[in-house]
């Protein structure tokens, strides 16, 4: 906490610029206008403040905003944005994509901090759900975000939105979260055609139940191997040598390489020893 | 509910062979979904699977130790059976038989039997 | 072999703390990775299974994450009951393995 002093004579701040620099902490608290910084905020990031006089701008708008920041100041926080904390940002009401835009570039390059998750939890919350837009830009900046989503968070995602999501979007999601967003994926891209189709849905069908692999495999999809080993277990041990055969098709020799692994292993185990014969590709069931 | 009950001699000389059955209550070892594991533990020690099996015959075994592991099904008694061929003083651990839920994972152990391999 | 490191072997926590204790497998297991909690004379109890589902009955301080190599086991308030053994387990492959084991001791 700085101490509250006088300001001396001629330094009185008249606009935020470069001068500023040379200011001593209990000058900057003595002499720049809380008001005159939050109107002039854009160009704070212009100037190269230390740390610790950062610390003093951040004083002086905690003590003009008692109840939080108004979107105004948010918006040009800039690198001001890492002296927050969750708690400061708690108290803030975001509703501009841009703004959150303008927050999340300060953050650019770096893992998710508490700050940013906070950010984007309220952004979230704001608006009652994850829309399009805001899902594009936040997997943008992280492409992990969606799976970073409880199941619950997952169930406000509407349908539209997916189609702003990637299949890196969906490397680190388990299957609860897959479980959510399948039923989504299918609605949206419920009107492509076959092949179409299959493309978008395909990094989504790690929560698909059998009766949807089972059509999939009257439709010469080719799934790929990658693709299969992400199938949930009950959704593959119901299904025919026969319908694995259709669902894979030119891939279907990928099965020996993946035998001792899960759901493959899960799957031959409980197939009979004729059936899986007729592959020709010696597994043991 | 099921539960799961190991039985067989506690101690064992060394180079003779280890004999241990598990026996299936409430429930069928014949389970379409479910495969029945061997764990053992040594005295202060860790958890190390030995292998599994399924009521059709197959099994799996612990790369480590399946020149000597046998595991077997008894549909007719609903039970699994374990057999380590030559023993030695490092096979002396708590044996443990259990069910693994494709779906989940090991959810029903027994509550486990010390065999010692002593002379 | 696929390998499964856990992280601590030992902590020593209070009632009321979070604890988290992380599991690495040596290749991908996808999410089939198991947590079990065993007390002294006891058979291990399933915690998790399939990396963040919550086995039936078991408390919902209780929580997993990850998927690939990288997996946690969090109690997000310790209690009485939770001063146990730790094991994690990968069922991916057909060797099925367990980590080493953390043991949650009381500060």
């Known amino acids: 906490e700085v101490e509250k002093t006088a300001c001396p004579s001629g330094k009185k701040a008249r606009e935020i610029d470069e001068s500023l620099i040379f200011y001593k902490k209990w000058e900057l608290e003595a002499c720049v206008d809380a008001a005159l910084l939050a109107t002039q905020m854009d160009r704070v990031n212009a100037i190269p403040f230390t740390y610790e006089q950062l610390d003093v701008l951040k004083h002086k708008l905690d003590e003009l905003y008692p109840q939080g920041y108004p979107e105004s100041v948010i918006q040009h926080l800039g690198y001001l944005f890492l002296k927050m904390s969750p708690e400061d940002i708690r108290k803030w009401n975001v509703t501009s994509l841009e703004t959150l835009k303008a927050l999340l570039e300060v953050n650019k390059g770096h893992e998710m901090s508490p700050q940013v998750a906070t950010l984007i939890d309220r952004f979230v919350k704001g608006r009652g759900q994850l829309d399009k837009d805001t899902l594009d830009t936040l997997t943008a900046f992280y492409p992990g975000y969606l799976c970073s989503l409880s199941p619950e968070e997952l169930s406000s995602v509407p349908p539209s939105s997916i189609w702003a999501v990637r299949p890196q979007d969906l490397d680190t999601c388990d299957p609860r979260q897959l479980d959510v967003l399948y039923p989504k994926a299918r609605l949206a891209f419920q009107n492509m055609n076959g092949s179409e189709y299959f493309v978008k849905i395909q990094s989504f069908l790690g929560g698909a139940p059998t009766e949807d692999l089972k059509a999939l495999s009257q439709q010469n999809v080719s799934m790929d191997l990658a693709t299969f080993m992400k199938l949930r277990t009950d959704a593959v041990l119901p299904l025919t040598v026969a319908e694995v055969q259709k669902l894979l098709g030119p891939h279907v020799e990928g099965l020996k390489a993946e035998e001792r692994h899960r759901p493959v292993r899960d799957w031959i185990l409980r197939q009979r020893q004729d059936d899986l014969d007729t592959l020709g590709l010696g597994l043991q069931g | 509910q099921v539960q799961l009950q190991e039985s067989g001699p506690g101690l064992v000389k060394p180079s003779e062979t280890l004999s241990l059955t598990c026996t299936v209550s409430?429930?069928?070892?014949?389970?379409?979904?479910?495969?029945w594991s061997w764990i053992r533990q040594p005295p202060g020690k860790g958890l190390e699977w030995i292998g599994y099996?399924?009521?059709?015959?197959?099994?799996n075994y612990n790369p480590s130790l399946k020149s000597r592991v046998t595991i077997s099904v008894d549909t007719s008694k609903n039970q699994f059976s374990l057999k380590l061929s030559s023993v030695t003083a490092a096979d002396t651990a708590v044996y443990y038989c259990?069910?693994?839920?494709?779906?989940?994972?090991?959810?029903?152990w027994g509550q486990g039997t010390m065999v010692t391999v002593s002379s | 072999d696929i390998q499964m490191t856990q992280s601590p072997s030992s902590l020593s926590a209070s009632v009321g703390d979070r604890v988290t204790i992380t599991c690495r497998a040596s290749?991908?297991?996808?999410?089939?990775l198991n947590w079990y909690q065993q007390k002294p004379g006891k058979a291990p109890k399933l915690l998790i299974y399939?990396?963040?589902s919550l086995q039936s009955g078991v408390p919902s301080r209780f929580s997993g994450s990850g998927s690939g190599t990288d997996f946690t086991l969090t109690i997000s308030s310790l209690q009485p009951e939770d001063f146990a053994t730790y094991y994690c387990?990968?069922?991916?492959?057909?060797?099925?393995?367990f980590g080493g084991g953390t043991k949650v001791e009381i500060k």
């Open positions: 290749q991908s297991i996808s999410s089939y």
């Open positions: 409430g429930g069928s070892v014949s389970s379409y979904h479910d495969l």
């Open positions: 399939a990396a963040s």
């Open positions: 259990a069910r693994e839920d494709a779906l989940t994972g090991f959810d029903i």
């Open positions: 387990q990968q069922s991916y492959d057909a060797s099925y393995t």
């Open positions: 099996i399924y009521y059709s015959g197959s099994t």
